[in-house]
Each structure stands twice: as structure tokens, then as C-alpha cells.
Interface confidence: low
């Protein structure tokens, strides 16, 4: 069986002028997934991104996330790219900044 992920992008302020953008994929199966951030269409180096573990979400499906830190005002340059079981999608940053605890 294949259950495609639901993908959600959020922003959190970490310091003046900087934000962390987090791309969360949830409710997907099987567990193999690719999530990566792109800037102007080019994949960011892996040392500039942080990944969460792929974890079961209790419903027989999985969840994970990837985050990166960017300059506020440059959100439109960044997209989250997802690949899962032959499907792919690109998800832009909304630009809405939430006050959340950072992953960094």
C-alpha cells in the first residue's frame, strides 16, 4: 500500500532578521521519503539543513521534517521538495512567521 504524505511548511523566528523554515511530512507509508530544501530551485547543501527522524505516528504511517535557517524577507526564494513512492511535489514557504521553538 502507498499513503502519500501531507506536507506542511511553517516558519519560526529564531533571532532578529533570521527565521527557521520547517517542512513537515506526515501520515505517509512506506517510510522511505526524501525531503530537501531548495533555494531558487537549487538544493541546499546537506550541512545547511537539519532532518528529524522518520517516526511512526501511531496510525500505521510515518512522519518526519527538515528545517533550514534563512534571512527574513527571502522566504519566496525557498521551497521544500518532497519525493515519496514515485510522487513528488514542491511546497513554498507561506511567509507567515510563527513564534515557535526552533529545531536548531
Amino acid at each position: 500500500r502507498t499513503v502519500p504524505p501531507m506536507v506542511n511548511v511553517t516558519c519560526s523566528e529564531v533571532s532578529e532578521g533570521n527565521i527557521t523554515v520547517t517542512c513537515r511530512a506526515s501520515s505517509f507509508y512506506p517510510r522511505n521519503i526524501t525531503l530537501t530544501w531548495r533555494q531558487d530551485g537549487v538544493s541546499l547543501s546537506h550541512n545547511t539543513q537539519q532532518w528529524g527522524d522518520v517516526l511512526p505516528d501511531g496510525n500505521g504511517t510515518y512522519q518526519t521534517w527538515v528545517a533550514t535557517r534563512i534571512r527574513q524577507g527571502e522566504e519566496q526564494r525557498f521551497t521544500c521538495y518532497m519525493e515519496h513512492s514515485g510522487n513528488h511535489g514542491t511546497h513554498p514557504v507561506s511567509g507567515k512567521v510563527l513564534v515557535l521553538q526552533s529545531h536548531w
Epitope: N32, T34, G41, V42, S45, H46, G86
Partner: antibody
Framework: QVQLQESGPGLVKPSETLSLTCTVS????????GHWIRQPPGKGLEWIGM???????DYNAAFISRVTISVDTSKNQFSLKLSSVTAADTAVYYC?????????????WGQGTLVTVSS | EIVLTQSPGTLSLSPGERATLSCTAS???????LHWYQQKPGQAPRLLIY???NLISGIPDRFSGSGSGTDFTLTISRLEPEDFAVYYC?????????FGQGTKLEIK
């Protein structure tokens, strides 16, 4: 059965453009990305670049001024073009599939094609 | 760029023995992005282990991988004649995505 097959000229003149095509079967390039890697005779492996399933490319910075990777999903092919070649570009060139969930590892490879740069 | 140094360059062992191959990175590599390949003469490389320790389907369980940070290891618990080949580690942590120079495993 997953297969990849490189094709193209085995001899290229210095300063010209090396052009190779990777024809795949057993999977679709709309669902798997592809890599190009090369191996000079008697030496190790060098990653050239990759193409994602949506057509975006990532290149080794060492080649970025002269490399182009493209895809033709209708023919199940992706291609490598390397311009301004020199003798240092003589190598076996491999195409490989980007595995799902294998964190960009190359899970299937073509058998490789030797390209010699010589006048 | 991240330089991967493999040691030893050549390892001479007999069938049935244990092989330990080392891969040292010049800077830290996420374990998710460290892979191992096997290459036999005249053949393309094949993926053995991805993300440091995950065995590809169909690869015998005498192969195993471990490590973190800058030090990674490929172990073959009991060598079979078909295991004698060149082994490469590969990192996709930071561009350019480099390979080690290889360890040649030869029959003693």
C-alpha cells in the same frame, strides 16, 4: 527488471563537447532521479551531477561551468553534456539511479562507457 | 570539499577471514549520507550499504557497516571468494559529493 544503458561516442576531440545518453528500463524517470559518475582509467569514482524527478539538476562545482544534465521522460532517457573537454576527461562514464529513501545513494548503475579524449 | 580517506589501500586476506575497511572523512558527515559500494574488475559499482549501516536487499548479512562523525567502517564477517573486489565509501553530505579512493580487497 531495472536496467540503465549508457550510449554515445567513444572518442571525442579536445575542446569539443562530450555527449552521452542513459536509457533506462524497468522504472520511469518521472519517479526516480538519475546520477552521472565517471572513473578515469585505473582511478577512483568522481560524481558529476544528478537530475531530480521534476527536472531540477545538482552539479559538482568542479564541472558547473561546462556540464548540463537533462531528461527526456517520453524516451526514458537522461543525458550528459560536458563541453570543452581535455585529455583529463578521458574516463568510463556511468549513469546510475537515485534510490528512493536511500539518501541520494545510487542503487542501480549502467555498465559504463569508455570515452577517450584525443585528437 | 570533504575528503574521504580509505584504509588500508590494499587488504590481503584469505577466504573465511574477517575484513575491516575504514573510511575517514576530513570533516563530519551525517550518517544518513555515508554509503558503501563494491566494484569488481570490468564491472560497474554496486550499492552495498546506505546510510552507514543499512544493508541493501539481496546483499548477504556477512556485510555490515558502522560509524559516525568522521569515522566509518565496513566489515565483512567471513570472506567468500566473490567478496574480493574494490570497496568505495561515498558521502552525499556536502557538495561535491565525493568518494574515497577505494580499498582493494585481494586474496592472500
Amino acid at each position: 527488471q531495472v536496467q540503465l544503458q549508457e550510449s554515445g561516442p567513444g572518442l571525442v576531440k579536445p575542446s569539443e563537447t562530450l555527449s552521452l545518453t542513459c536509457t533506462v528500463s524497468g522504472f520511469s524517470l518521472t519517479t526516480y532521479g538519475g546520477h552521472w559518475i565517471r572513473q578515469p582509467p585505473g582511478k577512483g569514482l568522481e560524481w558529476i551531477g544528478m537530475i531530480w524527478t521534476d527536472g531540477w539538476t545538482d552539479y559538482n562545482a568542479a564541472f558547473i561551468s561546462r556540464v548540463t544534465i537533462s531528461v527526456d521522460t517520453s524516451k526514458n532517457q537522461f543525458s550528459l553534456k560536458l563541453s570543452s573537454v581535455t585529455a583529463a576527461d578521458t574516463a568510463v562514464y556511468y549513469c546510475a539511479r537515485k534510490g528512493h529513501g536511500y539518501y541520494y545513494a545510487m542503487d542501480y548503475w549502467g555498465q559504463g562507457t569508455l570515452v577517450t579524449v584525443s585528437s | 570539499e570533504i575528503v574521504l580517506t580509505q584504509s588500508p589501500g590494499t587488504l590481503s586476506l584469505s577466504p573465511g577471514e574477517r575484513a575491516t575497511l575504514s573510511c575517514t572523512a576530513s570533516s563530519s558527515v551525517s550518517s544518513s549520507y555515508l554509503h558503501w559500494y563494491q566494484q569488481k574488475p570490468g564491472q560497474a559499482p554496486r550499492l552495498l550499504i546506505y546510510s552507514t549501516s543499512n544493508l541493501i536487499s539481496g546483499i548477504p548479512d556477512r556485510f555490515s557497516g558502522s560509524g559516525s562523525g568522521t569515522d566509518f567502517t565496513l566489515t565483512i564477517s567471513r570472506l567468500e571468494p566473490e567478496d574480493f573486489a574494490v570497496y568505495y565509501c561515498h558521502q552525499y553530505h556536502r557538495s561535491p559529493f565525493t568518494f574515497g579512493q577505494g580499498t582493494k580487497l585481494e586474496i592472500k
